[in-house]
């Protein structure tokens, strides 16, 4: 039975040209995390494999940095980066857990940030 829950940064906003950390945390399970995939719609942004480390998809290599931890840092943000992001936790023996984050990239000089996991 899948007992785990994913806590995410939820709905967040950031300034155009800036950077933001996407962060998820899996809790309430003893399942082993084998891999975490970061996705945007049908695009795979990055994979963090427990044994092999990070793979950043070539489409995003210039603007995506691994970490901190299992999180992902998006850099040089544009308005087109606005949208849903998903962290997919592949675990054994539970299976797959999915977390959702909504990012809004703002043109204005002042962007409201969510309370957790954000770059100050």
């Amino acid at each position: 039975m899948m007992t785990g829950t994913i806590e995410t940064t939820g709905n967040i906003s950031a300034e155009k040209g800036g950077s933001i950390i996407l962060q998820c945390h899996l809790s309430s399970t003893t399942a082993q995390v084998t891999q975490v995939n970061w996705e945007q719609q049908d695009q795979l942004l990055a994979i963090c494999n427990a044994d092999l480390g990070w793979h950043i998809s070539p489409s995003f290599k210039d603007r995506v940095a691994p970490g901190p931890g299992l999180g992902l840092t998006l850099q040089s943000l544009t308005v087109n980066d606005t949208g849903e992001y998903f962290c997919i936790y592949h675990t054994y023996p539970d299976g797959t857990y999915t977390g959702r984050i909504f990012l809004e990239v703002l043109e204005s000089s002042v962007a409201e940030h969510g309370a957790r996991f954000q770059i100050p």
Epitope: N37, L44, N49, D51, L52, G53, H55, S59
Partner: antibody, heavy 120, light 107 residues
Framework: EVQLQESGPGLVKPSETLSLTCAVS????????WNWIRQPPGKKLEYIGY???????YYNPSLKSRVTISRDTSKNQFSLKLSSVTAADTAVYYC??????????????WGQGTTVTVSS | DIVMTQTPLSLSVTPGQPASISCKAS??????VAWYLQKPGQSPQLMIY???YRYTGVPDRFSGSGSGTDFTLKISRVEAEDVGVYYC?????????FGGGTKVEIK
């Protein structure tokens, strides 16, 4: 250039253990991921498992109870052991390198393959 | 496990003509797909990774496309050296799995 060379017996009796070794030249096995893949006659390529740069292993769940992948860093080689073999384990066995950081799970260097037949 | 299904099983192409191979995944694998060519008597060689990126040294007549569950490998103008069996592979999640292969021959 990275070169991989499989070696081991071409004939194994049913219920015995298949043992293969892959000698690697031109690259250290303490970097990247080192893999075994097989292809039974007329069937799909099947991923067996890997040993990572740090020595961690992953085995395909369909073979997990019978597979051991190990390495000898002093000889720059890694090995496959598959126990309790049957005729279904008859295949061409490939050792291969995977550069996860750059190519994800895409295998960029392959050995030439060695044919193993399981028969009494 | 994710099942990768390739079509057609075989393809006979006139030199200079285009060729197209399809690969369907049993579930969404985003863009975590690679393509290989296994020439007669040789090991597989990597052609495409991340669905659409050519590996080092692969001629630009080869192109990959797709995301989600449907992927395509195209050869814009087939040459004699392109014969062999083409395989797709997903690496979205372990165990990484391969398609059954498409054999490309020259007419």
């Amino acid at each position: 250039e990275v070169q991989l060379q499989e070696s081991g017996p071409g004939l194994v009796k049913p219920s015995e253990t298949l043992s293969l070794t892959c000698a690697v030249s031109g690259y250290s096995i303490t970097s990247d991921s080192w893999n075994w893949i097989r292809q039974p006659p007329g069937k799909k390529l099947e991923y067996i498992g890997y040993i990572s740069y740090s020595g961690n292993t992953y085995y395909n769940p369909s073979l997990k109870s019978r597979v051991t992948i190990s390495r000898d860093t002093s000889k720059n080689q890694f090995s496959l052991k598959l126990s309790s073999v049957t005729a279904a384990d008859t295949a061409v066995y490939y050792c291969a390198r995977l550069d996860f950081s750059n190519y994800g799970g895409a295998v960029d260097y392959w050995g030439q393959g060695t044919t193993v037949t399981v028969s009494s | 496990d994710i099942v990768m299904t390739q079509t057609p099983l075989s393809l006979s192409v006139t030199p200079g003509q285009p060729a197209s191979i399809s690969c369907k995944a049993s579930q969404n694998v985003r863009t975590a797909v690679a393509w290989y060519l296994q020439k007669p008597g040789q090991s597989p060689q990597l052609m495409i990774y991340s669905a659409s990126y050519r590996y080092t040294g692969v001629p630009d007549r080869f192109s990959g496309s797709g995301s989600g569950t449907d992927f395509t490998l195209k050869i814009s103008r087939v040459e004699a050296e392109d014969v062999g069996v083409y395989y797709c592979q997903q690496y979205y999640t372990t165990p990484w799995t391969f398609g059954g292969g498409t054999k490309v021959e020259i007419k």
